[in-house]
Interface confidence: low
């Protein structure tokens, strides 16, 4: 069973998936669609790196631009370094400014 077939089988269960499962899924060439991504638990999405989200969404990663003001994308952007976001080339704004030392990301959540 390839990644896309596997994804179709588990798609309906993904709403409650933990971060660990999403990280594993990002390694399986699933090309998750934006509608499914937007239904994921915010707390499960937040720890994902830019590279992991890029792999998880595949070609659908471009859809992050249109969803940048909506959760969980908005909250995820706030936790990423701006220079990492810039590698996507989507013009996503609101990441941690380049050069800043990140001491406590949970503090940033509380402030947003």
């Amino acid at each position: 069973m390839n990644g896309s077939e596997y994804f179709v089988k588990i798609q309906s269960f993904l709403g409650g998936a933990p971060t660990e499962d999403l990280k594993a899924l990002s390694q399986q060439n699933v090309s998750m669609d934006l509608a499914t991504f937007m239904k994921l638990r915010t707390d499960a999405v937040l720890p994902l790196t830019v590279a992991e989200v890029q792999k998880l969404l595949g070609p659908h990663v471009e859809g992050l631009k249109a969803e940048e003001r909506h959760r969980p994308v908005r909250d995820w952007i706030l936790r990423q370094r701006q220079d990492d976001l810039d590698t996507l080339g989507l013009g996503l704004q609101g990441g941690i400014p380049n050069g800043y030392l990140v001491l406590d990301l949970s503090m940033q959540e509380a402030l947003s």
């Epitope: 990644g3 896309s4 595949g58 070609p59 659908h60 859809g63 631009k65 249109a66 080339g89 013009g91």
Partner: antibody, heavy 120, light 109 residues
Framework: QLQLQESGPGLVKPSETLSLTCTVS??????????WGWIRQPPGKGLEWIGS???????FYSPSLKSRLNISVDTSKKQFSLKLSSVTAADTAVYYC????????????WGQGTLVTVSS | EIVMTQSPATLSVSPGERATLSCRAS??????LAWYLQKPGQAPRLLIY???TRATGIPARFSGSGSGTEFTLTISSLQSEDFAVYYC???????????FGQGTKLEIK
């Protein structure tokens, strides 16, 4: 009814810059739902993706053309533009502008195309 | 770069008959594959996307199938307006690097 109209010189000299503009009418170029792209087709040959641009100005280029290519957007004029520098005869082609949904890389609406010949 | 290979280069079929066109990707493109039709002197027109979904206004006689690296476009009963060149295109790469097949010319037998 959406319309895409390419415009620009039909003849460009070798080593010069090819410049084309696509005007969008009957729809919004500023929609967050679409990218706007360029595809070309040399005479009697297949299709080649050149690049795409979002209304914000974010652009993606074909790796083989990236060093010579610039694609920009002017939302106030409802236009997006292609500039390809240092052209050679190999750049002779029909150039199409097209609309691309942001959620996928397919091209769902095309202009009629314009032939650009590179010759001295 | 993902290379898309279409076969055959030319296909001769009689009107009313069935036509089967193939497209192979050099590596998996999941289901992110589209088919276009192009008539002489015209721009390509989107037929199928997501491997099997017909674009708006495309007749039911056009159908697509496959996944991964092997894809097929089937035209169940050829009409005179269906004779044209058909291209497949993958859009499964990030950053975007979309590639087309070299085309299959469908001609009247």
């Amino acid at each position: 009814q959406l319309q895409l109209q390419e415009s620009g010189p039909g003849l460009v000299k070798p080593s010069e810059t090819l410049s084309l503009t696509c005007t969008v009418s009957g729809g919004s170029i500023s929609s967050s739902s679409y990218y706007w792209g360029w595809i070309r087709q040399p005479p009697g040959k297949g299709l080649e993706w050149i690049g795409s641009v979002y209304y914000s100005g974010s652009a993606f280029y074909s790796p083989s053309l990236k060093s010579r290519l610039n694609i920009s957007v002017d939302t106030s004029k409802k236009q997006f533009s292609l500039k390809l520098s240092s052209v050679t005869a190999a750049d002779t082609a029909v150039y199409y502008c097209a609309r691309r949904p942001y959620k996928s890389g397919l091209f769902d609406f095309w202009g009629q195309g314009t032939l650009v010949t590179v010759s001295s | 770069e993902i290379v898309m290979t279409q076969s055959p280069a030319t296909l001769s079929v009689s009107p009313g008959e069935r036509a089967t066109l193939s497209c192979r990707a050099s590596q998996s493109v999941s289901s992110n594959l589209a088919w276009y039709l192009q008539k002489p002197g015209q721009a390509p027109r989107l037929l199928i996307y997501g491997t099997s979904t017909r674009a708006t206004g495309i007749p039911a006689r056009f159908s697509g199938s496959g996944s991964g690296t092997e894809f097929t476009l089937t035209i169940s009963s050829l009409q005179s307006e269906d004779f044209a060149v058909y291209y497949c295109q993958q859009y499964n790469t990030w950053p975007p690097e979309y590639t087309f097949g070299q085309g299959t010319k469908l001609e009247i037998k």
